[in-house]
Amino acid sequence: AQNITARIGEPLVLKCKGAPKKPPQRLEWKLNTGRTEAWKVLSPQGGGPWDSVARVLPNGSLFLPAVGIQDEGIFRCQAMNRNGKETKSNYRVRVYQIPGKPEIVDSASELTAGVPNKVGTCVSEGSYPAGTLSWHLDGKPLVPNEKGVSVKEQTRRHPETGLFTLQSELMVTPARGGDPRPTFSCSFSPGLPRHRALRTAPIQPRVWEPVPLEEVQLVVEPEGGAVAPGGTVTLTCEVPAQPSPQIHWMKDGVPLPLPPSPVLILPEIGPQDQGTYSCVATHSSHGPQESRAVSISIIEPGEEGPTAGSVGGSGLGTLALA
């Protein structure tokens, strides 16, 4: 059988080989499609209810004015020419519909490195056969279940038209230190060959690098945190993340009532300033991160400064924020 591919809604003409070009003709068409059970016979003489779907033209060809999904199947013509020679034509008709350009909906503007993120949902409407959706990163195909990539797919069929709607939700786990502006796109590949893929417009979410806890560095001057009475201690909270987070300070696990600042200065140290200090970096996009704690202690003249002083009183003494 000769394979014929026809677009849904378009007309189709199937030639009856060997048929006389005009009546009288001895020919018959046989159809076995979604509209028939077994075979339906159509002849040049018989105009009727089937004419809206398929009718025999004066030249013996079969004319389908608007091909539908139910017209998929086998079409056969048997014709006899003026000399009594019989010729058979055999067609296998498959139909297709190209959907509208796929779109990425619910797309993320920002992804977080190191954790799974929903990038977006690719939607294609009105295809037949269903076809497939695939995702691309920087122009290269993304393989599901590899390197933190997962895809959730859904296929629905319109109850009246029989056309398909495809949905594909992409989840990725961006690597730390990777591309800060990856380019994602999605493409629809038709279920029938010889039709090119349709690609969405690309999306370029930003990748945000969360600052791990150990990266919130607390630097103490003098080193070790041991200082003579009346001396000055400078605590600096270093956070490499951009944009700069808000820094708050804690003493002995209690927030200090001070405005946010990356530097805390303790001038004229007294016993009440002794204790354990830490800083807390608060990012707009996720929760707070606390630094390691350091002990501030007073050493009497002649003593060796300990690396970790004992916890002192709870008084704040005099604090200065840089």
């Epitope: 509209r35 028939t36 339906k40 018989g46 105009g47 209810p49 089937w50 004419d51 809206s52 779907v53």
Partner: antibody, heavy 119, light 107 residues
Framework: EVQLVESGGGLVQPGGSLRLSCAAS????????MTWVRQAPGKGLEWVAS????????YYPDSVKDRFTISRDNAKNSLYLQMNSLRAEDTAVYYC????????????WGQGTLVTVSS | DIQMTQSPSSLSASVGDRVTITCRAS??????VNWFQQKPGKAPRRLIY???NLADGVPSRFSGSRSGTDFTLTISSLQPEDFATYYC?????????FGGGTKVEIK
Amino acid sequence: EVQLVESGGGLVQPGGSLRLSCAASGFTFNNYWMTWVRQAPGKGLEWVASIDNSGDNTYYPDSVKDRFTISRDNAKNSLYLQMNSLRAEDTAVYYCARGGDILVSLDVWGQGTLVTVSS
Amino acid sequence: DIQMTQSPSSLSASVGDRVTITCRASQDVGIYVNWFQQKPGKAPRRLIYRATNLADGVPSRFSGSRSGTDFTLTISSLQPEDFATYYCLEFDEHPLTFGGGTKVEIK
């Protein structure tokens, strides 16, 4: 609301002519074949004529062929039945109905119009 | 031409009864048979299309089935409003042919 309304029925003498009309509303008229069906008093239903959506092809049973003509005006959403050489046996209620092909067959009907052929 | 032989031509039944009406086509018409209900002085109303499909707004007590060239309309539990005349229609070929009708009366 999908609606079909027939008009034009009445009393006519044998050999006379009558033109029936059917006004369609509530659907895209030129997407559908249309059909006339009749019912003689106390009898069953009988197909009279069908026309395809463009109006290019018309279909009749032998009982009315060459006497009746079905036509349509898609711009006016109207279906017509021109009846000539009327006989007593044409007396019936005439219904217009949507469809008539294998895709849609007589899913919506008008209320009917009575044609009486009598001297 | 295709003949549609409908039986019975009339039947008497009571509310709640199961009623079956059949049409036999004289040749293969595929699935292209409809069933209609008609009440006195009213236009026919399509109940079943393409042999087995329930038309919009039709109660589920109506159903259609097909076995070869035999087509059946079943009313599972007859209701007072179901007393009417029922017709089958073949629309696979011209001339379109109706069955002779079945009048369902109150017993």
